[in-house]
């Protein structure tokens, strides 16, 4: 799917739009809000009843090159006694983000937008149980 | 997309860093992944820290629709189906990259933007302190 053109009738394409070759788009990768610091809840990944670990993936041909992925530590959830309860499930919560992929073809380079699915953390769910005949 | 030379052995050798502005193919790789979390799983209902999903729409952004999670309760659902307020439902937040039309309303000119989204909720056991 292509990125949708501005199709709303109340939008007028401004005269100031930069010229772009067909089939391409101009992308400024100087990130808006790059330096915005997020006050995430500390240690939520350790204090959760469905705790998780983080792994950093690194790819020099991706922008951003660093993407952090979470993995649930347990199959079950941690109960009030600190023991794993396998009648409940720790499951990953995922979110899509965009990255820019650099592709090398011989002596030339092209850029491609890519959707990446990031595992953000885990939550504890009641499993749906089916009894198989 | 538009191509530019690269090293080694290629003329006009290129920096390892990404250039500030790039020309990108309009087609997005992996575009068919499901963007509606209500359809992709029912974890938001079955979690011990359930959440509601709110649609955030902005035509100047790609993707134009982003789903934001809001925890349904302050506490977590216990085995009896009641809210246990000795535990916390806490949003799991993630910074994601989106495209912002720049200049505004331009069909094929964008800038990357970092936004913070609440993706879901998790149940947390808080450390308790008694204030003297």
């Amino acid at each position: 799917r292509k990125i949708p053109k501005v199709g709303h009738t109340f939008f007028q394409k401004p005269e100031s739009c930069p010229p772009v070759p067909g089939g391409s788009m101009k992308l400024d990768i100087g990130i808006i809000n790059e330096n915005q610091r997020v006050s995430m809840s500390r240690n939520i990944e350790s204090r959760s009843t469905s705790p998780w670990n983080y792994t950093v993936t690194w790819d020099p041909n991706r922008y951003p090159s660093e993407v952090v992925q979470a993995q649930c530590r347990n199959l079950g959830c941690i109960n009030a006694q600190g023991k794993e309860d396998i009648s409940m499930n720790s499951v990953p919560i995922q979110q899509e983000t965009l990255v820019v992929r650099r592709k090398h073809q011989g002596c030339s380079v092209s850029f491609q937008l890519e959707k990446v699915l990031v595992t953000v953390g885990c939550t504890c769910v009641t499993p749906v149980i089916h009894h198989v005949q | 997309g538009i191509t530019i030379p690269r090293n080694p052995g290629c003329p006009n050798s290129e920096d390892k860093n990404f250039p500030r502005t790039v020309m990108v193919n309009l087609n997005i790789h992996n575009r068919n992944t499901n963007t509606n979390p209500k359809r992709s799983s029912d974890y938001y209902n079955r979690s011990t820290s359930p959440w509601n999903l709110h649609r955030n729409e902005d035509p100047e952004r790609y993707p134009s629709v982003i789903w934001e999670a809001k925890c349904r309760h302050l506490g977590c659902i216990n085995a009896d189906g009641n809210v246990d307020y000795h535990m916390n439902s806490v949003p799991i937040q993630q910074e994601i990259l989106v495209l912002r039309r720049e200049p505004p309303h331009c069909p094929n000119s964008f800038r990357l933007e970092k936004i913070l989204v609440s993706v879901g909720c998790t149940c947390v056991t808080p450390i308790v302190h008694h204030v003297a």
Partner: nanobody
Framework: EVQLVESGGGSVQPGGSLRLSCAAS????????FGWFRQTPGKEREFVAG????????EYANSVKGRFTISRDNSKNTVYLQMDSLRPEDTAVYYC?????????WGQGTLVTVSS
């Protein structure tokens, strides 16, 4: 360190009203929710009311719904509990709770007595 200052407790007749307040100071940033529990002798502390800081979403125990109202003043890091139509069974020590998601602070408590 976080400090919690509770006030507003006291004695009142059935049907009367009281307003509790709890002010947080110190390193009380990244508040998840702020609220009140209560405890009567020989019983466990029970949740009364809470207000989520990010969006002012409120939650109440069934026993106080429609009678108690929780509100907040963001600028003062203060939470209020307006208690109307008080009943003898509302007699308890009311504890302020400041929740920072992974850490929770309990106040020392303020006594509310409802009797004729």
């Amino acid at each position: 360190e976080v400090q919690l200052v509770e006030s507003g407790g006291g004695s009142v007749q059935p049907g009367g009203s009281l307003r509790l307040s709890c002010a947080a100071s110190g390193r009380a940033n990244s508040i998840n929710w702020f609220g009140w529990f209560r405890q009567t002798p020989g019983k466990e502390r029970e949740f009364v009311a809470g207000i989520r800081w990010s969006d002012a979403y409120t939650e109440y125990a069934n026993s106080v719904k429609g009678r108690f109202t929780i509100s907040r003043d963001n600028s003062k890091n203060t939470v209020y509990l307006q208690m109307d139509s008080l009943r003898p069974e509302d007699t308890a020590v009311y504890y302020c709770v400041l929740d920072l998601s992974t850490v929770r602070y309990w106040g020392q408590g303020t006594l509310v007595t409802v009797s004729s």
